[in-house]
Interface confidence: low
Amino acid sequence: QDDDFFHELPETFPSDPPEPLPHFLIEPEEAYIVKNKPVNLYCKASPATQIYFKCNSEWVHQKDHIVDERVDETSGLIVREVSIEISRQQVEELFGPEDYWCQCVAWSSAGTTKSRKAYVRIAYLRKTFEQEPLGKEVSLEQEVLLQCRPPEGIPVAEVEWLKNEDIIDPVEDRNFYITIDHNLIIKQARLSDTANYTCVAKNIVAKRKSTTATVIVYVNGGWSTWTEWSVCNSRCGRGYQKRTRTCTNPAPLNGGAFCEGQSVQKIACTTLCPVDGRWTPWSKWSTCGTECTHWRRRECTAPAPKNGGKDCDGLVLQSKNCTDGLCMQTAPDSDDVALY
């Protein structure tokens, strides 16, 4: 660049037929220098008798321009285009509050027009993230926030999130949301969201990955319903009844808490013991009756059977022939006869 170059530009122009002011068909666009690769700035204006670049308020030397001109067949106006190359050294040599900038200035007989300023910046991407995501353990259906502030860079880094090395697309999976400040929100954590999450920052210079944050979606255990009470375990006297439940509704997962409380409940129970019946002693034989028999009896009441105890086994009444007493005949001996 050369301060004296301005004197090479014409101060007045011939009185040509009136022309419109130049307008830019293409204006220079902001550019980034990556490592030591120079950038080209380009612009095109019509009508234009001259076109030059000015960088940081100083004219760029004529020899540093590559200029091309042609006549637009439709309008008959001169179209001029120009490009310059900006090196990293030139950008580094500029000090002050404002970034390195260039703009195009085009002349026609009607006057001059300036393009917008195109800023040229040295591109970089720092290595360290300003904030990296931290691993979390969350319960099912809980909202999860993973924070990421990318490394400082020019141009500003774009951010994407990886779930186990796959790019997260919030359009495809509505359960994910990426905020304007690059944080990842899992709206309602699902078991399938248990994964390693990585924040990726990239610009034209480099791509950087944050440390990986492991999200574990856990499920706390829940009890099943109680079973029915069992029968009393003692057939006679004091015992207990029990009922059970299991931690399977749902079962704990990914380190979720086991169910709190008892899996077994017992209550005391008493079963009445069975009493088997026993015979009373036989009664005395009755006097011999007219039919030449007499009898005796006993009862199943000593004690009587209770609570499902066994009944007495055997005869209640016993009889046998006799010849004394009121017997009117002599009868031969006979076997006992049981009367029920």
């Epitope: 301060d3 990293r88 580094e92 040599e93 970089y124 290595k127 210079v205």
Partner: antibody, heavy 116, light 111 residues
Framework: QVQLQQSGGGLVKPGGSLRLSCAAS????????MSWIRQAPGKGLEWVSY????????NYADSVKGRFTISRDNAKNSLYLQMNSLRAEDTAVYYC?????????WGQGTMVTVSS | NFMLTQPHSVSESPGKTVTISCTGS????????VQWYQQRPGSAPTTVIY?????PSGVPDRFSGSIDSSSNSASLTISGLKTEDEADYYC??????????FGGGTKVTVL
Amino acid sequence: QVQLQQSGGGLVKPGGSLRLSCAASGFTFSDYYMSWIRQAPGKGLEWVSYISSSSSYTNYADSVKGRFTISRDNAKNSLYLQMNSLRAEDTAVYYCARGGGGMDVWGQGTMVTVSS
Amino acid sequence: NFMLTQPHSVSESPGKTVTISCTGSSGSIASNYVQWYQQRPGSAPTTVIYEDNQRPSGVPDRFSGSIDSSSNSASLTISGLKTEDEADYYCQSYDSSNHVVFGGGTKVTVL
């Protein structure tokens, strides 16, 4: 042959001043940034200042800012370092060098001793 | 403040290879160029590598420079070491204020 010839070093008392000069030859002086670098005895290199080709821009190390002034005279192909309020810790060999970022040609160095 | 850290010294036999590292304290060392200077005892420094890996004419191709973004460091490698390579070597870059920053220097001894 590209050369940088230095002069102006010497012994000076603390609080005193000194002006170093660097005469360039063998290249178009006005095309290049120029720098001053110093090296204390037994120590490493320390950048002091640089100046742009047209003197529009200068930059200084924090340790010398406000005390040292870099300047150049393109007509005389010369670079200067005006050092004021000198301190004992400014004792060093001072080198002039061509370039502001990568220094590709260096002067032979001149010794500046600040001592009472 | 941005700093460049070098090992204090390295030594190796003639014909062998030495590598000197230069690690940036912050930011990305790849964001700016790194230069390497050789300074023999009693002499002014000379450039052996500029712009990360470029060799000035006259510097043998035994000298090479590289940048490793992952470790945020630059390296100077001297292969086929010769006794004339015995010197102090300094790396240099710039900080965010465009101040020139030198490493502390590494003494290379040829055994």
